[in-house]
Interface confidence: medium
């Protein structure tokens, strides 16, 4: 029995619902009473959802999963996962058994956009060209870990004196804190760009020192 799932990972935003697509080709005369369907976590084999003996056996995964019962007879064994969390990320396997048996795994990639970075400048007054300043860039509650880039007003990357750290909170979302130490020119704009590598989303802010 051929079971089909998408090759590319399903990308889902934290807090939204995701559909993990899985399909099979039912033979003529197929009845749901013949169908055994199991969704499980690929690595741990933990049961997520099942359908057997013509009945939806329900969610075994925090009551956040559902099948599409009206579509099962047409070979649609997709799983709906509600209120996606970082901890849901990983591979899910769809097992379909009628008379024959088949399975395939689909990957779920979880993402969350980073907040617009906030920037602070220290010292923030009585600045002159030649002074060394510390510019702090903080962005919150994104996933996965961010890529942080600094650049000047002409778009030239600033890679020298940069310190970046990231830490996950208990929801698995990352906060990023990046510091640029720079010697001031006559006047200057400094930009911090926080990139989510999965969403290809850039959150950026600038500070201009005159």
């Amino acid at each position: 029995l051929e079971v089909q799932v998408p090759e590319d990972p399903v990308v889902a935003l934290v807090g939204t619902d995701a559909t993990l697509c899985c399909s099979f080709s039912p033979e003529p005369g197929f009845s749901l009473a013949q169908l055994n369907l199991i969704w499980q976590l690929t690595d741990t084999k933990q049961l997520v959802h099942s359908f057997a003996e013509g009945q939806d056996q329900g969610s075994a995964y925090a009551n956040r999963t559902a099948l599409f019962p009206d579509l099962l007879a047409q070979g649609n064994a997709s799983l709906r996962l509600q209120r996606v969390r970082v901890a849901d990320e990983g591979s899910f396997t769809c097992f379909v058994s009628i008379r024959d048996f088949g399975s395939a795994a689909v990957s779920l990639q979880v993402a969350a956009p980073y907040s617009k970075p906030s920037m602070t400048l220290e010292p923030n007054k009585d600045l002159r060209p030649g002074d060394t300043v510390t510019i702090t860039c903080s962005s919150y509650q994104g996933y996965p870990e961010a890529e942080v880039f600094w650049q000047d007003g002409q778009g030239v990357p600033l890679t020298g004196n940069v310190t970046t750290s990231q830490m996950a909170n208990e929801q698995g979302l990352f906060d990023v804190h990046s510091i640029l130490r720079v010697v001031l020119g006559a006047n200057g704009t400094y930009s911090c760009l926080v990139r989510n590598p999965v969403l290809q989303q850039d959150a950026h802010s600038s500070v201009t020192i005159t």
């Epitope: 906030s118 919150y140 509650q141 830490m167 996950a168 906060d175």
Partner: antibody, heavy 116, light 107 residues
Framework: EVQLQQSGPELVKPGASVRISCKAS????????IHWVKQRPGQGLEWIGW????????NYNERFKGKATLTADKSSSTAYMQLSSLTSEDSAVYFC?????????WGQGTLVTVSA | DIVLTQSPSHLAASPGETITINCRAS??????LAWYQEKPGKTNKLLIY???TLQSGVPSRFSGSGSNTDFTLTISSLEPEDFAMYYC?????????FGAGTELELK
């Protein structure tokens, strides 16, 4: 200049609740988490949790879940911590602090005394 | 939870001396340790974070070193205003935790 101005000392009875405030100035309120830290004499510092004023998400130390409730009012740039079902163990100085996962700016502390 | 053990708990020194305060974590925290200064009548002050990054405005006589489980705060050429309480704090994972503190007093 960044300042976190906390409310004054509180004397409360066992079993009661108290709400202390932390007013931020000198920076954009949504730029940092507001953390709360407990200090009992001779017992060092204990992290209670944070609130992110940008979206009022919270993150608590397991030890303080059910004890502390963190809220924030963006319009007044003020964060609040409510402590409930107070006992003598809750007598302490409570600090608010601004930062990501370390604390760049601190309030002056609020002394809470629980006594009959 | 990560336990931070600070030593010594008390330290007596004189202006001009160099002192070190140690902080040991119960498991690896990479480089993610901060140091604070506490003085009566003043708000707590962040000195160092990420093990060795000096907070803006903090004098260069303060320095931090270490990684994984063992960290050190060094104050070289002590000034009178440096006599205070010092705390370490890990920012590698939640819950955030602190050391019990080191009291630096005038000899």
């Amino acid at each position: 200049e960044v300042q976190l101005q906390q409310s004054g000392p509180e004397l409360v009875k066992p079993g009661a609740s108290v709400r202390i405030s932390c007013k931020a100035s000198g920076y954009t309120f949504t730029s940092y988490y507001i953390h709360w830290v407990k200090q009992r004499p001779g017992q060092g510092l204990e992290w209670i949790g944070w609130i992110y004023p940008g979206n009022v998400n919270t993150n608590y130390n397991e030890r303080f879940k059910g004890k502390a409730t963190l809220t924030a009012d963006k319009s007044s740039s003020t964060a609040y911590m409510q402590l409930s079902s107070l006992t003598s163990e809750d007598s302490a100085v409570y600090f608010c602090a601004g930062g990501t996962y370390f604390f760049a700016y601190w309030g002056q502390g609020t002394l809470v005394t629980v006594s009959a | 939870d990560i336990v931070l053990t600070q030593s010594p708990s008390h330290l007596a020194a004189s202006p001009g001396e160099t002192i070190t305060i140690n902080c040991r974590a119960s498991k690896s925290i990479s480089k993610y340790l901060a140091w604070y200064q506490e003085k009566p009548g003043k708000t707590n002050k962040l000195l160092i974070y990420s093990g060795s990054t000096l907070q803006s405005g903090v004098p260069s006589r303060f320095s931090g070193s270490g990684s994984n489980t063992d960290f050190t705060l060094t104050i070289s050429s002590l000034e009178p205003e440096d006599f205070a309480m010092y705390y370490c704090q890990q920012h590698n994972e939640y819950p955030l935790t602190f050391g019990a503190g080191t009291e630096l007093e005038l000899k």
